[in-house]
């Protein structure tokens, strides 16, 4: 049994780090493998993550963490029984993938303005809470070419757009994702999408 693709890990900078790797053949990850992780810190202890299958030869492990600070560094040991398959380390602050925003809502009752709001996925005491910026994706269900991205570079989890920038009388969907420049994170996953019917009063044309 050998590791074909070494574990790579990302942290949500809150309570979970996710490590993925591939074995050289079909593997029952949860029965055959264990990922041990230990914070490099005085009097710390090793903790065990039981991996799950992620495709035939792929494994994924969700490492529980109390919280994360920039100084944290973990040792990682991948074991198959008594055999050490791989040894590495992981610094969560250098591999951050934020949690996806939630509760995306489209408010359509604001005088021909669409107000999109969503929730910051972090509690106020988390460092990322005040460092997230967002991308909002809006697309038409009827027209695949009608696809747009709005970058929200301010901290408030909301976006206002004129309803008239979208076509009237058709359905649109929106989703939002987050990233944090301070830790050069990857983008989060997209939030679940929300759907609404866009309608607004066309202004009378004057000739």
């Amino acid at each position: 049994m050998k590791v074909l693709q070494e574990p790579t890990c990302v942290s949500d900078y809150m309570s979970i780090s996710t490590c993925e790797w591939k074995m050289n053949g079909p593997t029952n990850c949860s029965t055959e493998l264990r990922l041990l992780y230990q914070l490099v810190f005085l009097l710390s202890e090793a903790h065990t993550c039981i991996p799950e299958n992620n495709g035939g030869a792929g494994c994924v492990c969700h490492l529980l963490m109390d919280d994360v600070v920039s100084a944290d560094n973990y040792t990682l040991d991948l074991w198959a029984g008594q055999q050490l398959l791989w040894k590495g380390s992981f610094k969560p602050s250098e591999h951050v993938k934020p949690r996806a925003p939630g509760n995306l809502t489209v408010h359509t009752n604001v005088s021909d303005t669409l107000l999109l709001t969503w929730s910051n996925p972090y509690p106020p005491d988390n460092y990322l809470y005040n460092h997230l910026t967002y991308a909002v994706n809006i697309w038409s269900e009827n027209d695949p070419a009608d696809f747009r991205i709005y970058n929200v570079t301010y901290l408030e989890p909301s976006l206002r757009i004129a309803a008239s920038t979208l076509k009237s009388g058709i359905s649109y969907r929106a989703r939002v994702r987050a990233w944090a420049q301070c830790y050069n994170t990857t983008w989060s996953e997209w939030s679940p999408s929300t759907k609404w019917h866009n309608s607004y009063r066309e202004p009378f044309e004057q000739h």
């Epitope: 810190f41 009097l43 710390s44 202890e45 090793a46 529980l64 109390d66 600070v69 944290d72």
Partner: antibody, heavy 125, light 112 residues
Framework: EVQLVESGGGLEQPGGSLRLSCAGS????????MTWVRQAPGKGLEWVSS????????YYADSVKGRFTISRDNSKNTLYLQMNSLRAEDTAVYYC??????????????????WGQGTTVTVSS | DIVMTQSPLSLPVTPGEPASISCRSS???????????VDWYLQKSGQSPQLLIY???KRASGVPDRFSGSGSGTDFTLKISRVEAEDVGFYYC?????????FGQGTKLEIK
């Protein structure tokens, strides 16, 4: 009540051995790291050794490394310090102290918040 | 090893007056924001040491609020807002960021 009670001190000749014990009660012993600190007569405090809750991680002061062994028996809620090759400069009051909560991913530190009453070790010929 | 240097080594104080003890470490003791691994202990005559302050500024359970800790990085201070007769003894700072844990030399607080 959270309590630590040391025993095992006494008079020993240079080169001899002693085994100190520290019995813990009133807290979940296995969850916490434990530490030994000593104090020579008329001197300040000196750290001796520490051990994690599981016993997997152990640290020693250079002055005792290779001569002293820290261990614990979590089934008995007891911490030990085996002292071999004793020297006159090991003469001190030895205290055990409750250290950080080490079962969490990042050990939670609350100071050395409980100390035993101390046991006296005298090394003299 | 991290060296902890305390001052003053002797501190005569009038009851009711404030007192301050300084402790300087040879390297930074801040692991992350709010986590300075510095403690303060009081050892009264013939007794075991007792914890006063941990992580630089957190008061241990049962410690009177006249005791407070402050500082970050390498410079730390223990303050007693109004000294009482029962506060006499030796005060020690200690770093617990790394082994060997190291203590300051101790400050003897006595009543004038």
């Amino acid at each position: 009540e959270v309590q630590l009670v040391e025993s095992g001190g006494g008079l020993e000749q240079p080169g001899g051995s002693l085994r100190l014990s520290c019995a813990g009660s009133g807290f979940t012993f296995r969850d916490f790291a434990m530490t030994w600190v000593r104090q020579a007569p008329g001197k300040g405090l000196e750290w001796v050794s520490s051990i994690s809750g599981s016993g997997d991680n152990i640290y020693y002061a250079d002055s005792v490394k290779g001569r002293f062994t820290i261990s614990r028996d979590n089934s008995k809620n007891t911490l030990y310090l085996q002292m071999n090759s004793l020297r006159a400069e090991d003469t001190a009051v030895y205290y055990c102290a409750k250290d950080r909560l080490s079962k969490t991913i990042r050990p939670r530190y609350y100071g050395l918040d409980v100390w035993g009453q101390g046991t006296t070790v005298t090394v003299s010929s | 090893d991290i060296v902890m240097t305390q001052s003053p080594l002797s501190l005569p104080v009038t009851p009711g007056e404030p007192a301050s003890i300084s402790c300087r470490s040879s390297q930074g003791l801040l692991y992350s924001i709010g986590y300075n691994y510095v403690d303060w202990y009081l050892q009264k005559s013939g007794q075991s040491p007792q914890l006063l302050i941990y992580l630089g500024n957190k008061r241990a359970s049962g410690v009177p609020d006249r005791f407070s800790g402050s500082g970050s990085g390498t410079d730390f201070t223990l303050k007693i807002s109004r000294v009482e007769a029962e506060d006499v003894g030796f005060y020690y700072c200690m770093q617990a960021l790394d082994t060997p844990y190291t203590f300051g030399q101790g400050t003897k607080l006595e009543i004038k």
